[in-house]
């Protein structure tokens, strides 16, 4: 039971956490224009993976999207690359996640392929989610960088009458969407993968035979143990001695795998 | 057919109150902003204030203490409130409809003309 | 604040001129993320309130005459007016949009 949960509690919360991702990789406000130093501006900038907005006070807001492909950043190319895997390894883990579910009957599917799948899941959610805080976290580098950087360029040159404010970005609402839809698929796959663990069959599958002493001599048949291991004929087998040793099928006619000495 | 009209006193007397009542017809006072601009006789356009489809307002810095527009959106009414008037507040007072664009001022009322005196 | 200066305060044409009219602002006006200019024009003839005429810097409202043209970048800017007809007679002023409070120029003054 508590497998289970664990297991459909992890598929939710990793559920969240890639509609989160791509939720974030879809925002305009990956960066926002900040207002310290212009509090009073009647437009407002802000930015995001694939375009790039203003919006005015009156209400018009235009948005342009970024058309170039070579002319874009490397580190923003890096973080589109990083957020995109993230919710191809999301979306895959969900779909191999949905199969792996205790509650969901398919075929006669072993619980040995179950736990495979949900710790496949596991995993995928985990890089997932790795995937999508490295990205949104590159991206939190580079805005701190450039901030300084404005900073630093904002107050050289001020010398004549004509003051040219520089537009200084910082964090959007996308990078705490991100940071925590990562956070949120990254707590999924562990779930998962500590869900595989009660999944996993135990792995003693065998036969025991057990000997008891006798007093007297024992004709043993040739042969006679031979359908003991449990994985040969359906078969009873025969008794072929009065004492000293019986087989475990004579309690339990088929092979199970929850034999024990 | 945009229009705006201002509705004011005319006369006030020095440190009383302005209110002027500018009623708009032909849009939503949800969708676009209300500018009040002023202007001394014989002088040039001053600025006062504006109060947007969201409500949100923005002041002239020289007359924040003293300033205050509000609205009422189900009665097309926008509202300018100028506290402690001096004689250099004799204005041509006009309300002016924000364009949605380039937060510029596409639609003008005729003006109230205001004398402070006593 | 923004501060606009205008110049000339006034001028006097002959109609048919071309006339140009300068506008100057104490900080840029372009903002980065569209490079769009924030500056309007407006025409006032006499005993009438303003009218829009440009906004944008550059971008004419509808119904204005294509002889009306404005133009410059950053923290100067030119208003020209091709072919001047007497029904331009009137005080152009220019405003900053950009940032509050919006501030007006002081106007320049058309005589024909």
């Known amino acids: 039971m508590a497998v289970t949960a664990c297991q459909g509690l992890g598929f939710v919360v990793s559920l969240i956490g890639i509609a989160g991702i791509i939720a974030a990789t879809c925002m305009d406000q990956w960066s926002t224009q900040d207002l310290y130093n212009n509090p009073v501006t009647a437009v407002f900038n802000y930015q995001g993976l694939w375009r790039s907005c203003v919006r005015e006070s009156s209400g018009f807001t235009e948005c342009r999207g970024y058309f170039t492909l070579l002319g874009l950043p490397a580190m923003l190319q890096a973080v589109r690359a990083l957020m995109i895997v993230g919710i191809v390894l999301g979306a895959i883990g969900l779909l191999v996640s949905i199969f792996a579910l205790k509650c969901i009957r398919i075929g006669s599917m072993e619980d040995s392929a179950k736990a495979n799948m949900t710790l496949t899941s596991g995993i995928m959610f985990i890089v997932s989610g790795l995937c999508a805080i490295a990205g949104v976290s590159v991206f939190a580098n580079m805005l701190v960088t450039n901030f300084w950087m404005s900073t630093a360029n904002m107050y050289t040159g001020m010398g004549g009458m004509v003051q040219t404010v520089q537009t200084r970005y910082t964090f959007g609402a996308a990078l705490f969407v991100g940071w925590v839809a990562g956070g949120l698929t990254l707590i999924g796959g562990v779930m998962m993968c500590i869900a595989c663990r009660g999944l996993a069959p135990e792995e003693t599958n065998y036969k025991a035979v057990s000997y008891h002493a006798s007093g007297h001599s024992v004709a043993y048949k040739p042969g006679g143990f031979k359908a003991s291991t449990g994985f040969g004929s359906n078969t009873k087998n025969k008794k072929i001695y009065d004492g000293g040793a019986r087989t475990e099928d004579e309690v339990q006619s088929y092979p199970s795998k929850h034999d024990y000495v | 057919q945009v229009q705006l009209k201002e509705s004011g006193p005319g006369l006030v007397a020095p440190s009383q109150s302005l209110s002027i009542t500018c009623t708009v017809s032909g849009f939503s006072l949800t969708t676009y902003g209300i500018n009040w601009v002023r202007q001394p006789p014989g002088k040039g356009l001053e600025w006062l204030g504006v109060?947007?489809?969201?409500?949100?307002?923005n002041y002239h810095s020289a007359l924040i203490s003293r300033l205050s527009i509000s609205k009422d959106n189900s009665k097309s009414q926008v509202f300018l409130k100028l506290n402690s008037l001096q004689t250099d507040d004799t204005a041509t007072y006009y309300c002016v409809k924000s364009s949605y664009y380039g937060n510029a001022m596409d639609y003008w009322g005729q003006g109230t003309s205001v004398t402070v005196s006593s | 604040d923004i501060v606009m200066t205008q110049s000339p305060s006034s001028l006097t044409v002959t109609a048919g001129e071309t006339v140009t009219m300068s506008c100057k602002s104490s900080q840029s006006l372009l903002n980065s993320g569209n490079q769009k200019n924030y500056l309007t024009w407006y025409q006032q003839k006499p005993g009438q309130p303003p009218k829009l005429l440009i906004y944008?810097?550059?971008t004419r409202e509808s119904g204005v005459p294509d002889r009306f043209t404005g133009s410059g970048s950053g923290t100067d800017f030119t208003l020209t007016i091709s072919s001047v007809q007497a029904e331009d007679l009137a005080v152009y002023y220019c405003q900053n949009v950009y940032s509050y409070p919006f501030t007006f120029g002081s106007g320049t003054k058309l005589e024909i």
């Open positions: 109060i947007w489809g969201d409500g949100s307002t």
């Open positions: 944008w810097a550059s």
